[in-house]
Interface confidence: medium
């Protein structure tokens, strides 16, 4: 028998520095977790102790903190090279800055293979990108070889900016011939490494003949066997075992997100490359693991540029940006309108002639808007200003919801109106009218939404049975502020871009902003 140790990360999202337990900015260093310096310590410890070790990443290194905003992927290549990753799969967020923003900083700089079997380049891009990413890679490990085959969510064109010259094929259809090719090369130990979410990971394990192990990402799935060491609740045991259509037991793993854990899977293969056993658990990278001094010193050196960036002007406002509790928790506020407009603008994807855009709606809990911005400071808006407005390091995500769920959400928005509670919703692409004289649960008297399947956008009444795409904070997608109906009833959830980054990009693009209060949220006469 031959034993392989797979160390894996996914959805790190720019968390190069250690973070607090909830993956936001580290405040109390003695209780902080993750970060590449700490990850390196643990990886090196395992590499020294065990003979056959692979370090893999399942995508979405890009996007999530000011590190990515400033360094645009150069930081990913630099520190992944320093940690000596063996392979990476492309995630949807790797395309956030377009194909050029992937090629120059990462694909050309990475000293490890970057993989995806279901992305096919066409037109002029085909020759430009040729060889920079691969469908699979055969890696020597000890005296054996291991095949790694990559995959990426086929929803990427709706979630990021891959352009028109990349085709995202069905994962299973694309993977099978590549795995077959590896078999003809006498590679009998094959890992599928990719970024399509836990449901697709399980399907790949079930349907793709010859895949021995699936290492996934995208859905931030936490798997654990035994008592979990932190706040994350396991979605199943680690590894999650899938019985394939040809009767094999295929381990599927994922390691939550944000570099908080290092996935640790030990696989035993027989001489024919069959998996005999698999066991392990994610390792919580808490403060009991010291940060590697040399990587930490490097982080501190790269950090200097970030501090300078956060005080630079992104754009100007010529109006007061009212992000006060008094406004945003009680009525339409122009800071809410600005943020929602930025969220929609960040999701412009003209992928179909029938639709002006795939999504037109935004909702945002007023309690998530934490500060106003005064225009009397020469109108200057900095990253620092925006960090006060959006201090939680969340993301603006894409979900699909039925109209009936949206209606419940808007009822929840005002179910105890007047208490300055955070659930009061700010909106974009939505016109809502409340009657507060009615009883809670029956206060929404009008709810119109902006059409998407139209050449001239206009507002139509919400249809209860129709499925709508909505952009919202990950906090709401996870049921925060009492929006349990969103969490329970959402039909699809894809994590998006860092909240501050979305707004800062929009302000930089617009140069001068002047958001108004324009009647998106109204109260019928006599009730307000």
């Amino acid at each position: 028998a031959w034993e392989l140790t797979i160390l894996h990360t996914n959805d790190v999202h720019s968390r190069l520095e250690q973070t607090s337990e909830d993956s936001s900015k580290c405040v109390n260093a003695s209780r902080c977790m993750g970060g590449v310096a700490r990850l390196f310590t643990k990886v090196q410890q395992i590499r020294r102790a065990e003979p056959n070790v692979l370090l893999l990443d399942a995508g979405d290194q890009y996007q999530g903190t000011i590190w990515f905003t400033v360094y645009k992927g150069a930081e990913v290549a630099h520190f992944m090279n320093a940690l000596r990753y063996d392979a990476m799969a492309l995630g949807n967020h790797e395309f956030d800055n377009g194909v050029e923003g992937l090629i120059e900083p990462l694909l050309k700089e990475a000293k490890f293979p970057i993989l995806s079997a279901n992305i096919k380049a066409k037109g002029p891009l085909a020759s430009q990108i040729s060889g920079l990413y691969l469908p699979y890679k055969v890696l020597p490990v000890g005296d054996e070889v291991v095949g790694i085959v990559g995959y990426t969510s086929k929803e990427t064109p709706f979630l990021s900016n891959p352009g028109t010259n990349l085709v995202f094929e069905d994962e299973i259809t694309a993977l099978q011939p590549e795995v077959d090719k590896l078999k003809t090369l006498n590679v009998n130990k094959i890992i599928a490494l990719g970024h399509s979410g836990f449901e697709m990971d399980k399907l790949i394990a079930q349907k793709v003949r010859g895949v021995d192990v699936v290492v996934g990402g995208h859905s931030n799935t936490f798997l654990y066997t035994g008592n979990p060491p932190s706040k994350e609740v396991p979605a199943g045991k680690y590894p999650f075992i899938v019985t394939s259509d040809d009767g094999r037991k295929v381990p599927v793993v994922q390691a939550y997100a944000f570099g908080k854990y290092l996935g640790y899977l030990k696989i035993e293969f027989d001489e024919r490359g069959n998996v005999i056993s698999s066991h392990g658990n994610p390792i919580l990278l808490n403060s009991s693991i010291p940060e590697d001094p040399s990587i930490k010193a490097d982080i501190n050196k790269w950090r200097i540029k970030l501090d300078n960036y956060s005080t630079q002007e992104l754009g100007k406002t010529i109006v007061y940006l009212d992000g006060s509790s008094q406004s945003c928790r009680f009525r339409e506020c122009n800071m809410g309108n600005l943020i929602c407009d930025a969220m929609i603008n960040n999701n412009l994807r003209h992928t179909d002639e029938m639709f002006w855009n795939h999504v037109s709606m935004c909702i945002l809990n007023g309690g998530g808007i934490r500060s106003p911005i005064d225009e009397r400071n020469n109108g200057t808006i900095t990253w620092e200003n925006l960090a006060a407005v959006l201090p939680f390091g969340g993301t603006f995500d894409l979900v699909q919801l039925k109209g009936s769920t949206l209606k419940k959400a808007f009822e929840h928005s005002v179910h105890r109106y007047g208490q300055s509670t955070g659930e009061f919703l700010q909106v974009g692409g939505i016109h809502v009218v409340y009657d507060l004289s009615r009883k809670p649960g029956d206060r929404v008297v009008k709810l119109d939404v902006l059409c998407t399947k139209c050449r001239v956008p206009s507002y139509d009444p919400l249809k209860m049975d129709e499925v709508y795409k909505v952009i919202l904070p990950n906090f709401l997608a996870n049921g925060g502020d009492g929006f349990q109906m969103i969490k329970d009833e959402l039909l699809r959830h894809d994590s998006g871009d860092q909240d501050i980054n979305v707004v800062s990009t929009y302000i930089s693009k617009m140069k001068v902003i002047y958001p108004a209060v324009e009647g998106r949220i109204k109260f019928s006469t006599g009730s307000h």
Partner: antibody, heavy 121, light 107 residues
Amino acid sequence: QVQLVQSGAEVKKPGASVKVSCKASGYTFTSYDINWVRQATGQGLEWIGWIYPRDGFTKYNEKFQGRVTITVNTSISTAYMELSSLRSEDTAVYYCARKEGYRGDWYFDVWGQGTTVTVSS
Amino acid sequence: DIQMTQSPSSLSASVGDRVTITCRASGNVHNYLAWYQQKPGKAPKLLLYNAKTLASGVPSRFSGSGSGTDYTLTISSLQPEDFATYYCQHFWSTPWTFGGGTELEIK
């Protein structure tokens, strides 16, 4: 570690005012609400009001409206509760308590040690 | 204003006993309810929130249940350090009132 440290005991005459301070440390002061709660000797707890330090927004228990003022000084991470027109029934231990300002979970997770205010002629 | 009524106001029990304290609201508080423990001369300590979520570091012998207007705090097996006064508090609409307290003493 996260803590709220309150000012020392006060003895006041009826009709006077008292101002109690609450200094926060170990967390980002502007991200959490500060609440004030009082407890008369041998009695239960009574909520007075709260402030959101980032923008100074306050909400008071109507029972105290007009007599209570809650303020903050963010530069020193300190909240204040001033109660005026004191009467003997205001004799109590006054607590400050932190509430998560955003995450949708409602509770007071960190409390000050309490400040005894005695109103006596 | 929503009034919170706790019962019993005092309770004698022994180490190892299972104890239940109830809290009734005068209106629906929709699970926006927290439970606290207070020992003499000390500030209250958070036990549970959202009616049934255990606060960080609180032993699992404490549990909460209920919905609407009626809520319960249960201690499955009393320990010596559990003898204290317990308060419920709602967060539905201001003022956020507390229950009158339940004093738990050693039998």
